[in-house]
Interface confidence: low
């Protein structure tokens, strides 16, 4: 890969745990100012595979609140507004990074953690297993 | 809210930037070991609103590689396998946390950043604006 020269203004890294323990500034920078405003959307209600959003709260985690999508139906909504069980509503999942307080209840010490969240649902054609 | 007593074994937090600057252990703990293996799925291909996955790489970010979904069609795939433009394929977006090297190129100093990623696509009924 490309070798990027180290910035001489970097904080000291002579810690015996380096590079596993790093300094992180929690003043969040938001890169989303010019992104599509449709993210503030009602897709969860208008989708053919609609979902509900459930609040998952954990004070030992940062962010402490995460939203989990749960598909409303096994099937998908057809043009008549009925559930069509020939299709399947399935969750779209994503692994995200969160910070976990470690040791517990510490305000300024965290460990990086990967968790799997369901972001929404999509309608898929089911896999049909043919029996020989 | 509940006041959680501070753990006496916490690292020292007398830093003038506290609590904005914290220590983070980058040894990732993965909570997903027993989760549904379907997340490595072919939903992107089987969905009625299929999508392609694009690699987004940035060496100044952690994680450096993020996958972005782009919907293949404006419409959705109907039962005949054709694109139905009476419905819309739309991206399901999620704001996630990443670590951005700050100052740039520093191996052990980061700032928390929010970015918006498209995780997959779902099929929605379009909003029809009636003209009076």
């Amino acid at each position: 890969g490309i070798t990027i020269p180290r910035n001489p203004g970097c904080p000291n890294s002579e810690d015996k745990n380096f590079p596993r323990t790093v300094m992180v500034n929690l003043n969040i920078h938001n890169r989303n100012t010019n992104t599509n405003p449709k993210r503030s959307s009602d897709y969860y209600n208008r989708s053919t595979s609609p979902w509900n959003l459930h609040r998952n709260e954990d004070p030992e985690r940062y962010p402490s609140v995460i939203w989990e999508a749960k598909c409303r139906h096994l099937g998908c909504i057809n043009a008549d507004g009925n559930v069509d069980y020939h299709m399947n509503s399935v969750p779209i999942q994503q692994e995200i990074l969160v910070l976990r307080r470690e040791p517990p209840h510490c305000p300024n010490s965290f460990r990086l953690e990967k968790i799997l969240v369901s972001v929404g649902c999509t309608c898929v054609t089911p896999i049909v297993h043919h029996v020989a | 809210g509940i006041t959680i007593p501070r753990n006496p074994g916490c690292p020292n937090s007398e830093d003038k930037n506290f609590p904005r600057t914290v220590m983070v252990n980058l040894n990732i703990h993965n909570r997903n070991t027993n989760t549904n293996p379907k997340r490595s799925s072919d939903y992107y291909n089987r969905s009625t609103s299929p999508w392609n996955l694009h690699r987004n790489e940035d060496p100044e970010r952690y994680p450096s590689v993020i996958w972005e979904a782009k919907c293949r069609h404006l419409g959705c795939i109907n039962a005949d396998g054709n694109v139905d433009y009476h419905m819309n394929s739309v991206p399901i977006q999620q704001e996630i946390l990443v670590l951005r090297r700050e100052p740039p190129h520093c191996p052990n100093s980061f700032r928390l950043e929010k970015i918006l990623v498209s995780v997959g696509c779902t099929c929605v009924t379009p909003i029809v604006h009636h003209v009076a």
Partner: antibody
Framework: EVQLVESGGGLVQPGGSLRLSCAAS????????MAWVRQAPGKGLEWVAT???????YYRDSVKGRFTISRDNAKNSLYLQMNSLRAEDTAVYYC??????????????????WGQGTLVTVSS | DIQLTQSPSSLSASVGDRVTITCRAD??????MHWYQQKPGKAPKLLIY???NSEIGVPDRFSGSGSGTDFRLTISSLQPEDFATYYC?????????FGQGTKVEIK
Amino acid sequence: EVQLVESGGGLVQPGGSLRLSCAASGFPFSDYSMAWVRQAPGKGLEWVATIGPSGDTYYRDSVKGRFTISRDNAKNSLYLQMNSLRAEDTAVYYCASPPQYYEGSIPRLWPAHWGQGTLVTVSS
Amino acid sequence: DIQLTQSPSSLSASVGDRVTITCRADESVRTLMHWYQQKPGKAPKLLIYLVSNSEIGVPDRFSGSGSGTDFRLTISSLQPEDFATYYCLQTHSYPYTFGQGTKVEIK
């Protein structure tokens, strides 16, 4: 912390105009839909208008063509230009913003944060 | 427009009582129903959103339920600070509409 401060209310004669302002702080203003909600003295709440992040606007029927909702993202400000005012427009006008949750794909379509309100009185 | 009808319009109750307020929509609003509390001279305060989710900092004696057209706000054990007017709001379609309000008074 989210803060919304309305200004511009006052006494105006029927047929007159008034421009309300709402100064927002504590959140990325340009990312969010914003709304005006009013409350006539002793009455219930009434949604007036909403403006989306990209400038799309929505109005209740009784104010369409008379009121204009707008925003200045550079100034973190929301406005309501009220023309052809009627006695029935007399109310406390609240500026409202949606939730600031950013975790996940939560839709942000309902008021979660409110200003203190500014009183508009239409009377001769 | 979607009409929301709250009942009762007012009620008298004592501290410790269980109180339920209903909100009926004349067409389905799916899960896009929210509840607010308002005290005299103050701005409304969001209590419950998307039918049953409590806003941060709202006491857990407040809960919401329902779906489609019929929704309920329940206060499991009324406290002195809960005497106020409560409104439901639908954000399913424009124009957004509020219920006419339910005033909860001290018996």
